[in-house]
């Protein structure tokens, strides 16, 4: 960021998405800004209207092509800066060399479905959308079962050190609704942080057999 | 090597309108800003507005909101400044200027020779 | 809108020797991207502005090293470390942080 009042936080999908929040103290109210992307070594530049999301902060994604498309690598660098309009001009606001692979937060994992669910446990899978090919096994995922009279944030969190796009869930209540999401992270890249969490999956386990212990 | 160069000096009535062009050349003009600055005679510089020749964008000092206008011809680079509802305090030299389009370091880096505009009855 | 007042209004000064000018604005003008667009330029006997100091204390292209510009917030220098006669003319502080950008009243700088 060009200050100390400003913080401008992007970070790269690893496909063809940067996504950028600015957000600074007494910003500029009804002024039109835009984050501009120039890498070092591509014939193409992007720009995105930042549009708010609170009274001091501001968001936009930098499409950068079609959304499995490698538009990044590693030796990489993008000068990224927040444009603000004054009069007829445009004033940067911030500005930082981004290393995309560095900033990595990836898509949430998607199509999240129920395998094969029994009383006491369920088996779920899931897929990682938008992840480069670069990664190849070199990804770690966090799970999280939401239980009733519950909250997301009380669920212990599973943690799965590898590539692994499937979970088997145990010691479940039966004839029992929960609720269900994953998150992935890249192992690359020093300010690389989790993708956001899936949607949730509901689910039911299957009663227990009448008669019988449970 | 960037050049501005000015239409010749002009005089006027009390209520009439004056137009000043600024020649653009050495650069590409729909890359730049043009602003306008005047200087009264004996007087310091008051910046007027500017304009975007790439797009026809303007902005005008709110001192002379509703008696300026800024317009450009980017078929022959020139960009113009009218002046409406003269009156005398405008009598003064009125140049134009080039400005990068994104503000990061100065506001004008080259200016024109500058316009005599006189307003007597 | 932000004034701003230079002083003196006029600064006679012997050629070799060092001149200083004061340029004072009316509020802060640390814009809030944390830049100070604070601008100086030199109107020659005659002729149109020139940019000497851009950003407080940055040369213009071309600007010899004897310029030099200085100050934070509301508090603005020129110096011209030894006086040449191609220095004559007005001198003239500018603030482009805060829209209308607007000019000092300019100081006189002439030989004695």
């Known amino acids: 960021a060009v200050n100390g009042t400003s913080q401008f936080t992007c970070f790269y999908n690893s496909r063809a998405n940067i996504s950028c929040v600015w957000s600074q103290d007494g910003a500029l109210q009804d002024t039109s800004c835009q984050v501009h992307a120039w890498p070092d070594r591509r014939r193409w530049n992007q720009t995105c209207e930042l549009l708010p999301v609170s009274q001091a902060s501001w968001a936009c994604n930098l499409i950068l092509g079609a959304p499995d498309s490698q538009k990044l690598t590693t030796v990489d660098i993008v000068t990224l800066r927040v444009l603000c309009r004054e009069g007829v001009r445009w004033r940067v606001m911030a500005i930082q060399d981004f290393k995309p692979f560095e900033n990595l937060r990836l898509m949430a994992p998607i199509s999240l479905q129920v395998v094969h669910v029994e009383t006491h446990r369920c088996n779920i899978s899931w897929e990682i959308s938008q992840a480069s090919h670069y990664f190849e096994r070199h990804l770690e995922f966090e799970a999280r079962t939401l239980s009733p009279g519950h909250t997301w944030e009380e669920a212990p969190l599973l943690t799965l050190k590898q590539k692994q796009e499937w979970i088997c869930l145990e010691t479940l209540t039966p004839d029992t609704q929960y609720e269900f999401q994953v998150r992935v992270k890249p192992l690359q890249g020093e300010f690389t942080t989790w993708s956001p969490w899936s949607q949730p999956l509901a689910f039911r386990t299957k009663p227990a057999a009448l008669g019988k212990d449970t | 090597e960037v050049q501005l160069v000015q239409s010749g000096a002009e005089v006027k009535k009390p209520g009439a309108s004056v137009k000043v062009s600024c020649k653009a050349s050495?650069?590409?003009?729909?890359?730049?800003?043009i602003s306008w600055v005047r200087q009264a005679t004996g007087q310091g510089l008051e910046w007027m507005g500017e304009?975007?020749?790439?797009?026809?964008?303007?902005y005008y000092n709110e001192m002379f909101k509703g008696r300026v206008t800024m317009t450009r011809d980017t078929s022959i680079s020139t960009a113009y400044m009218e002046l409406s509802s003269l009156r005398s305090e405008d009598t003064a030299v009125y140049y134009c200027?080039?400005?990068?389009?994104?503000?990061?370091?100065?506001?004008?880096?080259?200016w024109g020779q500058g316009t005599t505009v006189t307003v007597s009855s | 809108d932000v004034v701003m007042t230079q002083s003196p209004l006029s600064l006679p000064v012997t050629l070799g020797q060092p001149a200083s000018i004061s340029c004072r604005s009316s509020?802060?003008?640390?814009?809030?991207?944390?830049?100070?667009?604070l601008e100086w330029y030199l109107q020659r006997p005659g002729q149109s502005p020139r940019l000497l100091i851009y950003?407080?204390?940055n040369r213009f292209s071309g600007v010899p090293d004897r310029f030099s510009g200085s100050g934070s917030g509301t508090d603005f220098t020129l110096k011209i470390s030894r006086v040449e006669a191609e220095d004559v003319g007005v001198y003239y502080c500018?603030?482009?942080?805060?829209?209308?950008?607007?000019f000092g009243g300019g100081t006189k700088v002439e030989i004695k």
């Open positions: 200027a080039r400005g990068s389009y994104t503000y990061d370091n100065y506001a004008m880096d080259f």
């Open positions: 050495g650069y590409t003009f729909t890359d730049y800003v």
């Open positions: 304009i975007y020749p790439g797009d026809g964008n303007t």
């Open positions: 509020q802060n003008i640390v814009h809030s991207n944390g830049n100070t667009y």
């Open positions: 950003k407080v204390s």
């Open positions: 500018f603030q482009g942080s805060h829209i209308p950008w607007t």
